[in-house]
Interface confidence: low
């Protein structure tokens, strides 16, 4: 009888854990949807305002090939850096190639000197894999130097010509990126 009761109790506990997990997933999903909604709104506003002036990038953004970059004049923690890029219809910088890395680091040298800038790279808490915001993995030459011994969430940032890692709750400048508008000729 006692064994039966404890089995039922364990089953109930397992059910509770599953429900908590589902609730947590739903909360994450809801937050993600809210951010995506804001991104879409910002993107629409951005597209409309850009349609009026035909330059490929907004004021204060730098152009390189098909991308526009915004180097922040304020600093914030990684999560809020991403939110602020979303608000501008962009995302945190995703470095696709060494050429792009060279352009970014060269531009930063001219603009600001040797500061820390968040990019859209974070470490998956479970697997320890580095991931860009779109879920893709960085190319081997663009993995952050192992610098952070933090037990907290770890995110990637650019400093001078290096890609480094740090606790996501530290405050840094950040770089946003979005597609440049094609001029309609």
């Amino acid at each position: 009888k006692l064994l039966q009761v404890s089995t039922i109790a364990m089953q109930q506990q397992e059910k509770l854990i599953q429900q908590e997990r589902a609730l947590l997933n739903f909360t994450e999903w809801k937050r993600s949807c809210a951010l995506q909604m804001k991104y879409c709104q910002a993107f629409m506003q951005n597209s409309l305002s850009s349609a009026h002036n035909s330059s490929p990038c907004p004021n204060n953004w730098i152009q390189n090939r098909e991308s526009c970059y915004y180097v922040s004049e304020i600093w914030s923690i990684w999560h809020t850096s991403q939110e602020n890029c979303l608000k501008e219809g962009s995302t945190l910088l995703q470095i696709e190639s060494k050429e792009e890395m060279d352009f970014i680091t060269g531009s930063l040298r001219k603009i600001k000197g040797s500061y820390d800038y968040w990019v859209g790279l974070s470490q998956d808490g479970h697997s320890g894999r580095w991931l860009w915001q779109d879920g893709s993995s960085p190319s081997p030459g663009l993995l952050p130097a192992e610098r952070s011994q933090s037990a907290n969430q770890v995110c990637g940032y650019v400093k001078s010509n290096s890609l480094l890692s740090s606790n996501c709750s530290t405050w840094k400048y950040f770089i946003c990126e979005k597609y440049a508008l094609r001029s309609s000729v």
């Epitope: 951010l35 804001k38 915004y70 922040s72 004049e73 304020i74 939110e83 602020n84 890029c85 979303l86």
Partner: nanobody, 117 residues
Framework: DVQLVESGGGLVQAGGSLRLSCATS????????TGWYRQAPGREREFVAQ????????YYADSVKGRFTISRDNARNTVYLQMNNLKPGDTAIYYC??????????WGQGTQVTVSS
């Protein structure tokens, strides 16, 4: 003219509580994200807590997690920091700030918090 005015600091015994307020004026409060920093004598100013503009997500320094709570009231243009279970190590001047993309960041004058053991 943008102004951030902190209040609520004071002297409290270890284990006690304080609630800091930061009243802002001259900015569109709801589009700024706001945070608290602190600076102890002879140390760098350090991040304490922040609340985002978009969905009231909150972020905390590890040293205050579980003890401090940041909140904001957009109707009153005010951000709060509820500090519980205070420790002597929390003694510092606490500053409130407001910032947004492409704009400057604004700071208050600070309010002194002293925790005695």
């Amino acid at each position: 003219d943008v102004q951030l005015v902190e209040s609520g600091g004071g002297l409290v015994q270890a284990g006690g509580s304080l609630r800091l307020s930061c009243a802002t004026s001259g900015l569109t409060f709801s589009s700024y994200y706001t945070g608290w920093y602190r600076q102890a004598p002879g140390r760098e100013r350090e991040f304490v807590a922040q609340i985002s503009w978009s969905d009231d997500s909150t972020y905390y320094a590890d040293s205050v997690k579980g003890r401090f709570t940041i909140s904001r009231d957009n109707a009153r243009n005010t951000v709060y920091l509820q500090m519980n279970n205070l420790k002597p190590g929390d003694t510092a001047i606490y500053y409130c700030d407001a910032r947004k993309v492409g704009g400057p960041d604004y700071w208050g004058q600070g309010t002194q918090v002293t925790v005695s053991s």
